[in-house]
Amino acid sequence: MRTEAQVPALQPPEPGLEGAMGHRTLVLPWVLLTLCVTAGTPEVWVQVRMEATELSSFTIRCGFLGSGSISLVTVSWGGPNGAGGTTLAVLHPERGIRQWAPARQARWETQSSISLILEGSGASSPCANTTFCCKFASFPEGSWEACGSLPPSSDPGLSAPPTPAPILRADLAGILGVSGVLLFGCVYLLHLLRRHKHRPAPRLQPSRTSPQAPRARAWAPSQASQAALHVPYATINTSCRPATLDTAHPHGGPSWWASLPTHAAHRPQGPAAWASTPIPARGSFVSVENGLYAQAGERPPHTGPGLTLFPDPRGPRAMEGPLGVR
């Protein structure tokens, strides 16, 4: 399942305005827009399961649906790793697995999926509504993170189905995964859009969000993400009561959420940055890891010259370049 832009239905142009050529130039941008948003966008899915035998024992399974090669997986709880979350395990495809309490056993299930069993006793044991996050660092897509928790009504031994959590493209590195033709198409799209600024706008069906909002959902952030843009990260309450999201501005958005670091909001980004995302199953939510916060000049592994992706949790020498770059 890919993240698709919800392209609004186009009204036919008024007679004499643009004619057949105008209609074609109107349709083409939306086709290209959809392509730009969907092509090569990977996904991370998270499944949280409470074991029937031990009521406070959890199994977290995560997978990466993308064509790139995974360079590291980090599992955390209580929120995204590095944003207040507690690191539970780090899995490197070639350097092995490291885990910390209450993680009991982390392992690779396949080349693109992992599982983690959590201990069920002690002060640090998880509770039913704890949020678990999996962050996949991959090449060339960059860093992708999804989070999930046990649905509130879950019976022991049951689990939420492994919901693919569509992650918004958050890395410049993703460009590498898109063909030159597509890149050209996106440039052409921008050119067309610029030209359309000087023409009467075609009538679009009103958006459900608000009459003033940009019509293409691909360009319009949800209320939730708009609110989240005012803070570096939405903060997750890690205590054992229903998790709440503290944002600068309360909003009536859906129960799932996507947030970008503040500095990402000011970065020029293509339409993919606001691709509309289907609502995941109850009890799980989507988080976006921007991946553009590596210090200037750092060279994470497998990247081309001068292309920065994300800090490499395998070890800081991976950021030194050329030494330590794997």
Partner: antibody, heavy 114, light 113 residues
Framework: EVQLQQSGPELVKPGASVKISCKAS????????MNWVRQSHGKSLEWIGD????????NYNQKFKGKATLTVGKSSSTAYMELRSLTSEDSAVYYC???????WGTGTTVTVSS | DIVMTQSPSSLSVSAGEKVTMSCKSS????????????LAWYQQKPGQPPKLLIY???TRESGVPDRFTGSGSGTDFTLTISSVQAEDLAVYYC?????????FGGGTKLEIK
């Protein structure tokens, strides 16, 4: 430049305790876990344990449980290891190493002697 | 615990010669999930901390000369130096990256004639 600067050599009496430090610089301390390794004179390397600054619950080699205690000071980007009930067997060079042993500290020589 | 056994314990060669050293583990270091071998090699020169050379049994750490090659799978691994240089004088350790506790071999000391 990524560096792990360890505290200076220690000369301690048997039965005493010592706390050695490893100050990290050149990277975000909380992004990487820290290992501690012992190397007795002219001998091989022994992994003592590891700790992630974002977790705080260390893993220990069973051999060093009760002997070593690992902690971190996030604000100072420093990892600590306390060794207690020292004997002459504990005389060694102690290294800290980040992540998957990618970068190693300068080493701290601990000598236990009466 | 996984026991790592290295051989020979020392060897002396002339510059330009090819050298191979062995490392055997008491349990397989092959991860069944992703079919990777979790073994690393380190070089420790006199008075210095160890330095990572090879990880994943055969992947050379960036900046490591291509004369160093790691090979092997399961329980038997080899480090080869195709043409020994004077600066390669060091002790070489293999390490189990597969399961806690991480264990190191006894080392192979390389001397240059």
């Amino acid at each position: 430049e990524v560096q792990l600067q360890q505290s200076g050599p220690e000369l301690v009496k048997p039965g005493a305790s010592v706390k050695i430090s490893c100050k990290a610089s050149g990277y975000t301390f909380t992004d990487y876990f820290m290992n501690w390794v012992r190397q007795s004179h002219g001998k091989s390397l022994e992994w003592i344990g590891d700790i992630h600054p974002n977790n705080g619950s260390p893993n220990y080699n069973q051999k060093f449980k009760g002997k070593a205690t690992l902690t971190v000071g996030k604000s100072s980007s420093t990892a600590y290891m306390e060794l207690r009930s020292l004997t002459s067997e504990d005389s060694a060079v102690y290294y800290c190493a980040t992540g998957y042993f990618d970068v190693w500290g300068t080493g701290t020589t601990v000598t236990v002697s009466s | 615990d996984i026991v790592m056994t290295q051989s020979p314990s020392s060897l002396s060669v002339s510059a330009g010669e090819k050298v191979t050293m062995s490392c055997k583990s008491s349990q397989s270091l092959l991860n069944s999930g992703n079919q990777k071998n979790y073994l690393a090699w380190y070089q420790q020169k006199p008075g210095q901390p160890p330095k990572l050379l090879i990880y994943g049994a055969s992947t050379r750490e960036s900046g490591v000369p291509d004369r160093f090659t790691g090979s092997g799978s399961g329980t038997d691994f080899t480090l080869t130096i195709s043409s020994v240089q004077a600066e390669d004088l060091a002790v070489y350790y293999c390490q189990n990256d597969h399961s806690y506790p991480w264990t190191f071999g006894g080392g192979t000391k390389l001397e240059i004639k």
